[in-house]
């Protein structure tokens, strides 16, 4: 009987023993597997990510095109318009001035007098820039550098006076403290007639002859 | 400190080309406009050309307009005046000098001048 | 141009006197004027600018005045150092222009 119970006993070890290894390979080979699934999974996830960047580029380099299709469409039919027009009213900005709000501006690179400048505009079918607003005063000092630059405004005639007839005394002022102070000790015949746009963007009264850099300013006709 | 130093006169012939320097150091040299200024022996100061801080601007005096041409390079810190058909007049010491702004605000720092002799 | 006129075009002074140069132009040029120094053999040094402002380093016995067309420089009380030539300059427009030039000597 002993004997009997210890053969079961063995063949039951035996069995137990293998049921062990065959279990331990089997889980050996889910986990080699699990890993490598693993792997497929983060190459795939690679894979879709560069698709997903590559797609977005795409659609960048898309999206540019077409504004700059759009963009190419608008100037061509807003020269061809012009073509047509009578010329008194720009229907689209000129090469090398800046859009603004309806307006087209021109930013000297050099230095005149005010009534050189002035004359310049006037041949460009324009005027000296005038000023209405903060948010248009924040955009001229962007672009102008940082030089003092000559402005549609001047006294020569009297009171303070913008070129395109704007009133003055209800518009936009921006002077540097103690400005303007018309000063008349330089014998010119009178006070510092002509106002500029200092280094910092503020306004500052000044000799007319100084030649200082200017802004060119022409209303786009707003239908287009 | 802020220093003005010409080079590259000479004696040379009525007619040729010579080309002065100044080099420029102790200062943020893209800032400022320069001149140039000459001297004839004996005579009083002539002012020759400006050119603005970033170059965009460029003026000259009646009597080397169309012959003379001034430059300058930010990044070598160094201003300069091409002198072509140059006429026994045109005999001087030249000095570069920094506008005390831009372009347009008057002469405060000289160099030490470079004589250019205009002779046959 | 504006035309610069000097005067005198040369002076004798002593040491510890007071000199006074004047400078005309030809038109109203603002406060847009310098006064420079130079000494024989040596390059022009910056005085003042806009008419009375002074240069750094440079003494308070420099002085500049004036407006319209009419300025002047003046050295409160000349010394050894002082003796030189003086020359005022507008910058209001291009081309810039210099006076002739004056000239004080040692009396």
């Known amino acids: 009987q002993n004997s009997k119970l210890r053969g079961e006993l063995q063949a039951l070890r035996e069995t137990f023993s293998n049921f062990t290894a065959s279990t331990e390979v089997e889980v050996k080979a889910l986990s080699s597997q699990g890993g490598n699934v693993g792997r497929k999974m983060k190459s795939l996830e690679s894979q879709l990510e560069k698709q997903q960047k590559d797609l977005s580029e795409d659609h960048s380099d898309l999206l540019l095109h077409v504004k700059q299709f759009v963009s190419d469409l608008r100037s061509l039919s807003c020269q061809i318009a012009a073509l047509h027009g009578n010329g008194s009213t720009l229907t689209c900005c000129p090469v090398n001035w800046l859009e603004y709000e309806g307006s087209c501006y021109w930013f000297s690179r050099s230095g005149k007098s005010w009534p050189e400048a002035d004359k310049y505009c006037q041949l460009e079918s324009a005027h000296l820039v005038v000023v209405n607003s903060r948010e248009e005063q924040k955009f001229i000092q962007h672009h102008m550098g940082p030089v003092n630059t000559w402005m549609g405004l001047t006294d020569q005639s009297g009171p303070w006076k913008w070129v395109d007839g704007t009133d003055y005394e209800t518009g936009f002022k921006n002077w540097r403290p103690e400005q303007p102070d018309d000063w008349y000790g330089h014998g010119l015949g009178g006070g510092e007639d002509c106002a500029h746009f200092t280094d910092d963007g503020r306004w500052n009264d000044d000799v007319c002859q100084r030649p200082y850099r200017w802004v060119c300013e022409a209303a786009r006709d707003p239908a287009t | 400190q802020v220093q003005l130093v010409e080079s590259g006169g000479g004696v040379v012939q009525p007619g040729r080309s010579l080309r002065l320097s100044c080099a420029a150091s102790?200062?943020?040299?893209?800032?400022?406009?320069m001149h140039w200024v000459r001297q004839a022996p004996g005579k009083g100061l002539e002012w020759v050309a400006v050119?603005?801080?970033?170059?965009?601007?460029?003026n000259y005096a009646d009597s080397v307009k169309g012959r003379f041409t001034i430059s300058r390079d930010n990044s070598k810190n160094t201003l300069y005046l091409q002198m072509n058909s140059l006429r026994a007049e045109d005999t001087a010491v030249y000095y570069c000098?920094?506008?005390?702004?831009?372009?347009?605000?008057?002469?405060?720092?000289w160099g030490q001048g470079t004589t250019v002799t205009v002779s046959s | 141009d504006i035309q610069m006129t000097q005067s005198p075009s040369s002076l004798s002074a002593s040491v510890g006197d007071r000199v006074t140069i004047t400078c005309r132009t030809s038109q109203g040029i603002g406060k847009y004027l310098a006064w420079f120094q130079q000494k024989p053999g040596k390059a022009p040094k910056s005085l003042l600018y806009?008419?009375?402002s002074l240069q750094s380093g440079v003494p308070s016995k420099f002085s500049g005045s004036g407006s319209g067309t009419d300025f002047t420089l003046t050295i409160s009380s000349l010394q050894p150092e002082d003796f030189a030539t003086y020359y005022c300059q507008q910058y209001m427009t291009y081309p810039l222009t210099f006076g002739g030039g004056t000239k004080v000597e040692i009396k």
């Open positions: 050119i603005w801080y970033d170059g965009s601007n460029k």
């Open positions: 102790g200062f943020t040299f893209s800032s400022y406009g």
């Open positions: 000098a920094r506008d005390q702004g831009v372009g347009y605000d008057g002469l405060d720092v």
């Open positions: 806009k008419v009375s």
